[in-house]
């Protein structure tokens, strides 16, 4: 750092005041010199160090009609707002000739009130979960005893006597406020007062209870939610696509899940109009006049089948002497399932019932027995899945086949009123 | 620096009140809390009562009927007041910034006819 | 009234021992607790705050260690300025209490 010669005399007549004040002052340390000839740049030292950028003035006044005369030169330097960084020792320097003067030091300072670094933040916790809050601050002057306070109480007899930085709370039943208290010298600083919300629990124990092809019926157990009664619960479903990830519960599935609200209790809610053999995830949330607690992780949940709802479409049933050609299509009504098969029934007037199982097939020739003079021969269809069997067709008569004829088409129901399926479902 | 100086009469009279009045610099006594110990010749220490930065007080059930504690801020002094004192209450008397960094350095109350 | 028994009530130990005093409240009193050092005719000095907390100028031999109701002051190596008696101090509830004090005498 740069030294004063003691060679000659000081050009200084004025030296840095000092200030001492609360952050955010402003004020101005002022040197004056006498030299002769042409005025010297005065620079600001701090601590020993040049301040380059430097927010000062420098007045320069001739006492005589000459260059070579006196001059009175006088620099302020301007502190605006001031800061921790701002303190410590001040003085002027000035080059003149070879040789370097420096003034006598001034003194900034900071003392003030209690200064935040770091408050107590709003947020949302779990009724009865722990957590932590945190509060900062510094003078000087120091120490800084902190002193919290939960719905303007003290939470310790004295100031410095309690938790100090960090605040541990080891759960609530309500929504509170948190503030704290800094005390030093010179007086007391509040903080702002943070409201902690006191949210339901997240629910435990999601479950199935029962199952049907379209509806599933859940359960779950809700969490405490303080003094705060549950006002209702909200469940979503989303069907699964394996490329979703979100057995883990992360991260929330790309499309609109489908919403359900449950009045509670009981905290149970069933759930209709879905597709049934179809692999959903679901999650529940209870909300209560503060707001909802935390979901769940998602569910993986599955409808079972269901029997198909129509019978086939488009019976055709010909007959050739002791042959009979029947063949179908695929019911239009929803399967509710993987199709395994079908099942065809035909009688006589006056013969028992032959049940056959076809298999996968939608066609096939039947050897009547005797000599195909078996009277109002008619057949029916019936689709089925692993649940069982679908509706069976209306009967068919067997027609017989005439060279050249189209083979005779049935439509053997009328149009089943099967339930529209479309999103949302409920 | 801070600083705290009791100042009292150093003898009372058995019944009579005794007025200790704590004199700080240094520190505002609108901040913080500001107490009164004291501690009986070859005793331990006992906890009298104090002032907070506001004006609230809280005193030693043991010694609530008798004793007051108040503050001049335009002063920055607060005072204590026991009243009824018998030869128990004889002790130093300290005043003291609760959070205990700063002390005065004691006055001895002897409490004599 | 919370009660603090502080043990033992007197100690005879060398320069360079370690020196040990324990403090038992009569209930949990959550760290709210602060160790003291007076010197004859001396008001006392704060050692540690909140069980654990070394206070500003302590020297770094001293040092504070419990929760819940027991709680410990140890002197690491005992130097000739540290002949002095000792109290506990529990803050958790009004009114204040400190424990009987432990004299540490040199042998």
């Known amino acids: 750092a740069p030294r004063g010669t003691q060679a000659e005399e000081s050009p200084f007549v004025g030296n840095p005041g000092n200030i001492t004040g609360a952050r955010g002052l402003t004020g101005t340390l002022r040197c004056q010199l006498q030299v002769q000839g042409e005025p010297p740049e005065v620079h600001w030292l701090r601590d020993g160090q040049i301040l380059e950028l430097a927010d000062s003035t420098q007045t320069q006044v001739p006492l005589g009609e000459d260059e070579q005369d006196d001059w009175i030169v006088v620099s302020q330097l301007r502190i605006t707002s001031l800061q921790l960084s701002d303190t410590g020792q001040y003085q002027c320097l000035v080059f003149l000739g070879h040789q370097t003067f420096v003034s006598q030091p001034g003194y900034v300072g900071l003392e003030g009130l209690p200064y935040f670094l770091e408050e107590p933040e709003d947020r949302t916790v779990a009724a009865n979960t722990p957590f932590n809050l945190s509060c900062q601050a510094q003078g000087p002057p120091e120490p800084v005893d902190l002193l919290w306070l939960q719905d303007a109480v003290p939470l310790a007899t004295a100031p410095g006597h309690g938790p100090q930085r960090s605040l541990h709370v080891p759960g609530l039943n309500k929504t509170s406020s948190f503030s704290c208290e800094a005390h030093n010298a010179k007086g007391v600083t509040t903080s702002r007062t943070a409201t902690i919300t006191v949210l339901p629990q997240q629910p435990r124990n999601l479950h199935l209870v029962s199952r049907q092809p379209t509806e599933l019926e859940v359960a779950w157990t809700p969490g405490l939610s303080g003094i705060y009664p549950l006002t209702h619960c909200t469940l979503q479903a989303v069907l699964s696509d394996d490329g979703m990830g979100i057995q883990a519960g992360e991260p929330d599935p790309p499309e609109e899940p489908l919403t359900s609200q449950a009045s509670v209790p009981p905290h149970q809610l069933r759930l209709g109009s879905l597709h049934p053999h179809t692999p959903y995830h679901i999650r529940v949330a209870c909300t209560s006049s503060q707001g909802p607690s935390s979901w769940t992780h998602w569910l993986p949940v599955e409808t079972p089948e269901g029997v198909p709802l129509g019978p086939p479409e488009n019976i055709s049933a010909t007959r050739n002497g002791s042959q009979a050609f029947v063949h179908w299509q695929e019911p239009r009504a929803p399967l509710q399932g993987t199709l395994l098969g079908y099942r065809l029934a035909y009688q006589g007037q006056d013969t028992p019932e032959v049940l056959m199982d076809i298999g996968l097939r939608q066609e096939v020739t039947l050897e009547l027995q005797g000599d195909g003079s078996v009277s109002n021969l008619t057949v029916c269809v019936a689709a089925y899945t692993a649940a069982g069997d679908g509706p069976w067709s209306l009967p068919v008569p067997l027609e017989a086949w005439r060279p050249g004829e189209a083979q005779p088409v049935h439509q053997l129901v009328k149009e089943p009123s099967t339930p529209a399926f479309s999103w949302p479902w409920w | 620096q801070v600083q705290l100086q009791e100042s009292g009469p150093g003898l009372v009279k058995p019944s009579e009140t005794l007025s200790l009045t704590c004199t700080v610099s240094?520190?505002?006594?609108?901040?913080?809390?500001w107490g009164w110990i004291r501690q009986p010749p070859g005793k331990g220490l006992e906890w009298i009562g104090y002032i907070t930065y506001s004006g609230s007080t809280s005193y030693n059930p043991s010694l609530k009927s008798r004793v007051s504690i108040s503050r001049d801020t335009s002063k920055n002094q607060f005072s204590l007041k026991l009243s009824s004192v018998t030869a128990a209450d004889t002790a130093v008397y300290y005043c003291?910034?609760?959070?205990?960094?700063?002390w005065g350095q004691g006055t001895l109350v002897t409490v004599s006819s | 009234d919370i009660q603090m028994t502080q043990s033992p009530s007197s100690l005879s130990a060398s320069v360079g021992d370690r020196v040990t005093i324990t403090c038992r409240a009569s209930?949990?009193?959550?760290?709210?607790l602060r160790w003291y050092q007076q010197k004859p005719g001396k008001a006392p000095k704060l050692l540690i705050s909140?069980?654990?907390n070394l206070a500003a100028g302590v020297p770094s031999r001293f040092s504070g260690s419990g929760s819940g109701s027991d709680y410990t002051l140890t002197i690491s190596s005992l130097q000739p300025e540290d002949f002095a008696t000792y109290y506990c101090l529990q803050s958790k509830e009004s009114p204040w209490t400190f424990g009987q004090g432990t004299k540490v005498e040199i042998k």
């Open positions: 240094g520190y505002s006594i609108t901040s913080n809390y």
């Open positions: 003291a910034i609760t959070t205990f960094y700063y």
């Open positions: 909140g069980a654990t």
């Open positions: 209930q949990d009193i959550g760290n709210y």
